[in-house]
């Protein structure tokens, strides 16, 4: 069972008085509609609260969007609705917050009557002031900021025009018509697909992929017969229709679309899809849907060029296009991902990888947990994690799994212990080692959040009844103390804390209901007095990540290196602080076969670390297409895993020869590429 709130857990003395002095209530008199909350900037304390509406709506004649601003992490709010001229802000556009600490905010308003265009409200001073700008178009999507320059904005119009602003939305220019999808790339590059004939839908598979590197002065067609495209890490992907049939294949470019290679992935038919699950500068996780409406597919992991793929996980749960997958990057430990598979018996099971998709295993059964009714053997079972799919199925799961890069090793998730995910009411489990071991943390479903880089975990029960209590832990979820934050319980809607888990403030949102009226209310609690002192050297202990067997010389080695971290001792009640930086020390490991993936034409039989030739390619010359040239590969079957830093040890031989022959895996050869200038 989960740890109780007994005397043994009385870790923080006199906490009630300390928290009571730091609990701030704010009642919002006239909030209606959907409430959205955004932090503006990092460590600024600025929060915007906006009520938005879906359009069309009957309510338009009665009300308006309300905008509130806090500059003290939610302790006090000021009504600044007059700054947006009492306009309606559309739910689907919400608040577009600028990258980094730019202080920029764009609100997209609904303008009634046959106006020429939409309207935006722009702020570049952390929402202190807004400038109203009428647009020469009606926006279809939220304004997109260039990651490199927050003055550059991109938007699609309802007429499928691609509009760009170079002065933070003051002036707009239509740089292209008939655009389906547009995305910022690196260095202020814009990628977009266009249709030639009827519409985006009608031309699917016959779209062109364009690029502009100068905000629309000049263009280059970098792909034809495009179905869709995506960006991940340093890779540009396009799914391209095959010449002869209705199947399509993934092509990949690492030079912004100048040259392309065909990815060694299965082609897919009309009803199937590809999905980039995760990508970084080293590699990509790609999901390839199975034929038919199976609800599952296969995960492949790429090499460093995004071309050669290794099968990583079969029967990966991913409902139809745009549907749900439980694929989760555990950001608190390098190389760890969690997802779900659909078993032959249609039950759903959780799998975890600690080595970036090299091997997947079930999650270890938590200590002190019983196997539930789904388990055939009452002593042998696993933990199964509820994520997006469970939430979409309206199971009693208020939150997806949570991890934070600066709260090393900590993963919090709802789960059940058995042979598969259970529809019973879940409990909350925690891992302090990145998913290797788990403990039941709280009984029943909860909202949870990490504060002060893991120094505090806060939780609130998910209940249909009003609540007035939150729980907090200063020892990574082992012991919990409860705090009554109000005498009058509220219908709880969510916990809100500043992204990045560095804050010590938590806001509890909800509403009170009395006869005929309901009022939104927030309680912001500052935990600074609970963690009275700053952490010192003695408050940290050394921890080796990915450790499974200390007797193994290479214990802790993942992707060619091991990392030791300084971690807060569970007994230390102190502040990591806003400026806390994770202290880690890497050390390089010797190479073993585990540090290599199987090269083109090779595969790994199950439970074997050796790569063997694919039977159908035995004795054939290994020739494949790379950047439009035929290459001859001399290999004994291994290629170093992307991002692997091992040195010495095993060193398989590998050589690639340019055959000086053209080949046509490229769906677009350089001579077909065209450029034009505006």
């Amino acid at each position: 069972s989960a740890p109780g709130e007994d005397e043994e857990c009385g870790r923080v003395r006199d906490f009630v008085a300390k928290l009571a002095n730091n609990t701030h209530q704010h009642v919002f008199d006239d909030l209606r509609g959907s409430v959205s909350l955004s932090w503006v900037g990092d460590s600024t304390g600025v929060i915007l609260v906006l009520t938005t509406f879906h359009v069309p709506l009957v309510i338009m004649t009665f009300g308006q969007s309300k905008l509130y601003r806090s500059e003290d992490y939610g302790k006090n709010f000021k009504d600044i609705t007059d700054l947006i001229n009492n306009t309606f802000i559309r739910t689907e556009f919400g608040m577009a917050i600028g990258p980094e600490n730019s202080g920029k905010v764009v609100l997209t308003a609904e303008v009634s009557g046959g106006s020429r265009g939409g309207r935006i409200f722009r702020s570049s001073d952390f929402a202190k002031n807004f400038v109203q700008t009428d647009l020469p178009f009606h926006p279809l999507t939220q304004m997109m900021y260039s990651p490199q320059n927050s003055d550059y904005l991109l938007a699609l119009s309802t007429e499928n025009g691609l509009w760009v602003s170079k002065n933070f939305g003051g002036k707009w220019e239509e740089i292209h018509k008939a655009v389906c999808l547009a995305k910022w790339g690196s260095d202020n590059t814009i990628f977009f697909t266009t249709y030639a004939n009827g519409s985006c839908k009608a031309d699917l598979g016959a779209l062109e992929l364009w690029r502009t590197s100068d905000l629309g002065k000049s263009f280059k067609t970098i792909g034809v017969k495009i179905y869709s495209f995506g960006l991940g890490g340093r890779f540009l992907f396009a799914s391209v229709m095959a010449d002869k049939d209705t199947t399509r294949r993934i092509h990949v470019s690492t030079d912004q679309g100048d040259t392309w290679s065909m990815a060694q992935l299965p082609s897919v038919g009309q009803e199937q899809f590809y999905s980039i699950l995760a990508a970084n500068d080293d590699m990509v996780f790609m999901h390839v849907d199975e034929p038919g409406d199976t609800g599952f597919g296969t995960i492949f992991t790429s090499d460093d060029r995004g071309i050669v793929y290794s099968k990583s996980l079969d029967r990966h749960l991913y409902t139809t296009t745009g549907g749900e997958t439980d694929f989760t990057n555990v950001t608190s430990l390098r190389g760890v991902y969690i997802t779900s598979v659909l078993s032959e018996d249609n039950s759903i099971q959780t799998m975890i990888t600690f080595d970036q998709g090299g091997r997947w295993t079930h999650l270890r059964k938590p200590e002190n947990s019983e196997c539930d009714a789904t388990a055939k053997n009452k002593n042998e079972c696993s933990l199964h994690i509820h994520a997006s799919y469970s939430i979409s199925q309206k199971l009693n799961v208020p939150m997806a799994p949570l991890s934070e890069p600066n709260a090393v090793g900590i993963v919090i998730a709802h789960g059940s212990v058995g042979d598969a995910i259970s529809v019973m009411v879940p409990d909350v489990y925690i891992s302090d080692d990145g998913g290797y071991s788990w403990t039941k943390m709280l009984e029943g479903p909860h909202y949870y959040t990490i504060l002060d880089s893991g120094g505090i975990i806060v939780a609130a029960e998910h209940s249909s009844r009003p609540i007035n209590v939150i729980k907090f832990s200063t020892d990574e979820g082992q012991c919990w103390q409860t705090y009554t934050f109000t005498r009058d319980p509220i219908y709880f809607t969510g916990l809100a804390s500043e992204p990045g888990a560095r804050s010590m403030n938590i806001s509890i949102w909800g509403f009170t209901e009395s006869f005929l009226t309901s009022q939104w209310v927030s309680y912001t609690i500052d935990f600074k007095d609970i963690l009275e002192r700053n952490c010192e050297e003695k408050d940290y202990t050394i921890w080796l990540a990915h450790s499974t067997d200390p007797e193994d010389y290479e214990d802790g080695c993942i992707l060619g290196y091991k990392e030791q971290f300084l971690r807060l001792r569970k007994s230390s009640v102190c502040q990591n602080g806003r400026d806390y930086v994770v202290t880690k020390q890497p050390s390089i490991c010797l190479c073993s076969l585990e540090d290599f993936l199987c090269d083109f034409g090779y595969y790994r039989p199950e439970n074997d670390s050796k790569c063997v030739e694919q039977p159908e390619l035995k004795g054939h010359d290994l020739e494949f297409c790379l950047y439009g040239r035929e290459e001859h590969l001399t290999t004994n079957g291994y290629r170093k895993i992307p991002g692997d830093k091992c040195q010495g040890g095993v060193n398989p031989v590998r050589e690639v020869k340019d055959l000086k022959k053209k080949c046509t895996s490229n769906f677009l050869s350089p001579e077909k590429q065209n450029s034009k200038s505006n």
Epitope: T541, I542, L544, E551
Partner: antibody, heavy 124, light 106 residues
Framework: QVQLVQSGAEVKKPGSSVKVSCKAS????????ISWVRQAPGQGLEWMGG????????NYAQKFQGRVTITADESTSTAYMELSSLRSEDTAVYYC?????????????????WGQGTTVTVSS | DIQMTQSPSTLSASVGDRVTITCRAS??????LAWYQQKPGKAPKLLIY???SLESGVPSRFSGSGSGTEFTLTISSLQPDDFATYYC????????FGGGTKVEIK
């Protein structure tokens, strides 16, 4: 089977320093922390500090901070403890001990292998 | 640093007795507690780690319990070989030992 073998007994003058060695054999020295614990005649056990050979991360009990230096040499699987500014109260048996490990935490599981102890006598 | 208080400091018992030694931490240390046995002129020997886990090779008559601040070492039936001094040790702060409990023949 892992063994820790310590250097021989030492007699030192007050104000001088002593360096005790602890050589590991039969296990993966680098993956465990080595702690140093002392025991004065007729007294209890007192932790002085420890080191993790990988990376050489050392940490010390507050009482000994500035007076003790713990090092490790991975190539010879040997840990060292040097205590300076010796006084008569430092007369004790000094033990090195391997910290047991079940997870990534180096210091949480007790000391499962001990050296035979080195007697250090401080006398003028 | 976390202080460990062991009681009693001396305990007289006979072979076959059930013996209980208590250790209290000055603040919560979760389950990060170890118990050792030491005989005169010898190095300590680990009996229990993580409050209740028995070290391999240690007889099952030794058991540990507790979490937070209160811990107990129990010898269910005292054997002639068990007369020694016992120490608790916390491992969640900078390591500290209890003062020891000497178990002697009654």
């Amino acid at each position: 089977q892992v063994q820790l073998v310590q250097s021989g007994a030492e007699v030192k003058k007050p104000g001088s320093s002593v360096k005790v060695s602890c050589k590991a054999s039969g296990g993966t020295f680098r993956n465990y922390a080595i702690s140093w614990v002392r025991q004065a005649p007729g007294q209890g056990l007192e932790w002085m500090g420890g080191i993790i050979p990988i990376g050489g991360w050392a940490n010390y009990a507050q009482k000994f901070q500035g007076r003790v230096t713990i090092t490790a040499d991975e190539s010879t699987s040997t840990a060292y403890m040097e205590l300076s500014s010796l006084r008569s109260e430092d007369t004790a048996v000094y033990y090195c001990a391997r910290q047991g490990r079940k997870t990534g935490y180096y210091y949480y599981y007790g000391m499962d292998v001990w050296g035979q102890g080195t007697t250090v006598t401080v006398s003028s | 640093d976390i202080q460990m208080t062991q009681s009693p400091s001396t305990l007289s018992a006979s072979v076959g007795d059930r013996v209980t030694i208590t250790c209290r931490a000055s603040q919560s240390i979760s389950s990060w507690l170890a118990w050792y046995q030491q005989k005169p002129g010898k190095a300590p020997k680990l009996l229990i780690y993580k409050a209740s886990s028995l070290e391999s090779g240690v007889p099952s008559r030794f058991s540990g319990s507790g979490s937070g601040t209160e811990f107990t070492l129990t010898i269910s039936s005292l054997q002639p070989d068990d007369f020694a001094t016992y120490y608790c040790q916390q491992a969640d702060g900078h390591i500290t030992f209890g003062g020891g409990t000497k178990v002697e023949i009654k």
